[in-house]
Interface confidence: low
């Protein structure tokens, strides 16, 4: 760092005085000295280093007529809103010829009430849940002590003989505040008063109860909710898509989810309106007058297969002499599953009904064996899927066969390349 | 490997209260799983009595539901049947067993026989 | 409840054969059925749940199939340990309920 030499008297003839005050204050530090000739330019060390970028002010008054008589140099430092990096040791220097002067030092000291590096954040917790809370301050002067106060009440009998920078809370079960409070020589800051919610707890083993084609029982177990009762849960339910694939963590559904709130108790809801035999995914999560629990991981499930909610449509059933001819088309209403075929029965007037499986075909031949003469031969067919038969059709008439023709109807099914089935 | 082990009196009178324990071995019953009672009639007969969650909810039968209670001990990671105003009709070989949610039952203890009689 | 009705209650057959195990359920129980394997001395041992899917350590001699109301259990080129009585379950809905069982014996 520059020295002053001893060869000459040192010019300064004012020398920085010491500030001391707490963080924000505005100060000023000032050095003097007297110069024959032209004036220097006054620069100004902190700790030994030249300070590039000080806001400082230099006012040369003459002390005579002439340029080579004395003048006074006045140097000003303006420190505005004190900080802990501002402390330190000031001086001023000039260079004068070949040798260079500082004056004698001056301090600048940061010292007040404590300042918080680090304060307690509003937050929401579930319900008898551990947390944490941060609190950091510092001073000058030090040592700092923290003192922490749940709803206004400290929770140490005294600043330093509690938890200092992490307060670890083992569970609330109302919401409550929490501030810190700083304590140094100097006197005592406190902090901002977080407020900390308590929600309920995310709901349990959410699980199927039961299944139908349409609908899903679910149940769950409810989460501690402190004091609050729980007022709802909501139920959302999203059809799967393996394309975006929900992730168990994943926050937001990939499209609008069908959303359902339960009164509580019972902790259990039917959630109706559903696609048959459709996977979905749902999650839950409950309410109290704090607010909103977080939701349960997204949990696949699956609505059964239903049968067919229709028959079979457009059935007509004409016959060719000792053949009947009956086709139909796939019923409009909803299958409820993956349609797996079609049961067929007929009937006459004096005849037993006949019972027959088509499979996944829409038409079929009846081979009427015999020469008889049938009444009022009736045809219904329905649709089946795994779950079951679908709803008949009504019953489709033949038209009347032709008199003389004495066998009853009793056996049937001929398809070219198929074997005949018979029923006794 | 987890293994369950049912124990508990072979012998009850009617009107009183049957209590069995089943043990856990190998796992923790609050970790994960249903705990399950099942029980087996002279002539085969299965009958699923409850299940107790890890999470401590219980599920029952409905045909038995103003008799039974499930519950457990997780220090000694042990859980209990207690089955009230037994008749003879209870006489059975009673189980217990480990499910996940609505899969089957992949452990189940060597079960215990319990006579009904006075 | 679901009643379950499996048959037959009785079976003998020899080693090598391939025999099915039929249970019907009162409804659709989706593909909600598992097979268990009892044995005297040893603990019931799962076979099969979900309908189809082979739990784990269970040869692939084990099959399962069906859907809806309909289910069979297939043992194929029977083993001398095959011999046992087996049940199946419904775990579609509670309570849970069981078939009355078939005892498989050596023909």
């Known amino acids: 760092a520059p020295r002053g030499t001893q060869a000459e008297e040192s010019p300064f003839v004012g020398n920085p005085g010491n500030i001391t005050g707490a963080r924000g204050l505005t100060g000023t530090l000032r050095c003097q000295l007297q110069v024959q000739g032209e004036p220097p330019e006054v620069h100004w060390l902190r700790d030994g280093q030249i300070l590039e970028l000080a806001d400082s002010t230099q006012t040369q008054v003459p002390l005579g007529e002439d340029e080579q008589d004395d003048w006074i140099v006045v140097s000003q430092l303006r420190i505005t809103s004190l900080q802990l990096s501002d402390t330190g040791q000031y001086q001023c220097l000039v260079f004068l010829g070949h040798q260079t002067f500082v004056s004698q030092p001056g301090y600048v000291g940061l010292e007040g009430l404590p300042y918080f590096l680090e304060e307690p954040e509003d937050r929401t917790v579930a319900a008898n849940t551990p947390f944490n809370l941060s609190c950091q301050a510092q001073g000058p002067p030090e040592p700092v002590d923290l003192l922490w106060l749940q709803d206004a009440v400290p929770l140490a009998t005294a600043p330093g003989h509690g938890p200092q920078r992490s307060l670890h809370v083992p569970g609330l079960n109302k919401t409550s505040s929490f501030s810190c409070e700083a304590h140094n020589a100097k006197g005592v800051t406190t902090s901002r008063t977080a407020t900390i919610t308590v929600l309920p707890q995310q709901p349990r083993n959410l699980h199927l109860v039961s299944r139908q084609p349409t609908e899903l029982e679910v149940a769950w177990t409810p989460g501690l909710s402190g004091i609050y009762p729980l007022t709802h849960c909501t139920l959302q339910a999203v059809l799967s898509d393996d394309g975006m694939g929900i992730q168990a963590g994943e926050p937001d559904p990939p499209e609008e989810p069908l959303t359902s709130q339960a009164s509580v108790p019972p902790h259990q809801l039917r959630l109706g309106s559903l696609h048959p035999h459709t996977p979905y995914h749902i999650r839950v999560a409950c309410t109290s007058s704090q607010g909103p629990s977080s939701w349960t991981h997204w949990l696949p499930v699956e609505t059964p297969e239903g049968v067919p909610l229709g028959p079979p449509e457009n059935i007509s059933a004409t016959r060719n002499g000792s053949q009947a001819f009956v086709h139909w088309q796939e019923p409009r209403a909803p299958l409820q599953g993956t349609l797996l075929g079609y049961r067929l029965a007929y009937q006459g007037q004096d005849t037993p009904e006949v019972l027959m499986d088509i499979g996944l075909r829409q038409e079929v031949t009846l081979e009427l064996q015999g020469d008889g003469s049938v009444s009022n031969l009736t045809v219904c067919v329905a649709a089946y899927t795994a779950a079951g038969d679908g709803p008949w059709s009504l019953p489709v008439p033949l038209e009347a066969w032709r008199p003389g023709q004495a066998q009853p109807v009793h056996q049937l099914v001929k398809e070219p390349s198929t074997p005949a089935f018979s029923w006794p | 490997d987890v293994q369950l082990q049912e124990s508990g009196p072979d012998l009850v009178k009617p009107s009183q209260s049957l209590s069995l324990t089943c043990t856990v071995t190998g796992y923790s019953i609050t970790s994960a799983y249903s705990w399950h009672w099942i029980r087996q009639f002279p002539g085969n007969k299965l009958e699923w009595m409850g299940y107790i969650h890890y999470s401590g909810s219980t599920n029952y039968n409905p045909s038995l539901k103003s008799r039974i209670s499930i519950t457990r001990d997780t220090s000694k990671n042990q859980f209990f049947l207690q089955l009230s105003s037994v008749t003879t009709e209870d006489t059975a070989t009673y189980y217990c067993?480990?499910?996940?949610?609505?899969?089957?039952?992949?452990?189940w203890g060597q079960g215990t026989s319990v006579t009904v009689s006075s | 409840d679901v009643q379950i009705t499996q048959s037959p209650s009785y079976l003998a057959a020899s080693p090598g054969e391939t025999i099915t195990i039929k249970c019907r359920a009162s409804k659709s129980i989706s593909k909600y059925l598992a097979w268990y394997q009892e044995k005297p001395g040893k603990t019931n041992k799962l076979l099969i749940y979900?309908?189809?899917t082979l739990h784990s350590g269970i040869p692939s001699r084990f099959s399962g199939s069906g859907s809806g109301t309909d289910f069979t259990l297939t043992i194929s080129s029977l083993e001398p340990e095959d011999f046992a009585m087996y049940y199946c379950?419904?775990?579609?809905?509670?309570?849970?309920?069981f078939g009355g069982g078939t005892k498989l014996e050596i023909k």
């Open positions: 379950q419904q775990h579609n809905e509670y309570p849970w309920t």
């Open positions: 067993a480990r499910s996940l949610w609505f899969y089957a039952m992949d452990y």
């Open positions: 979900s309908g189809s």
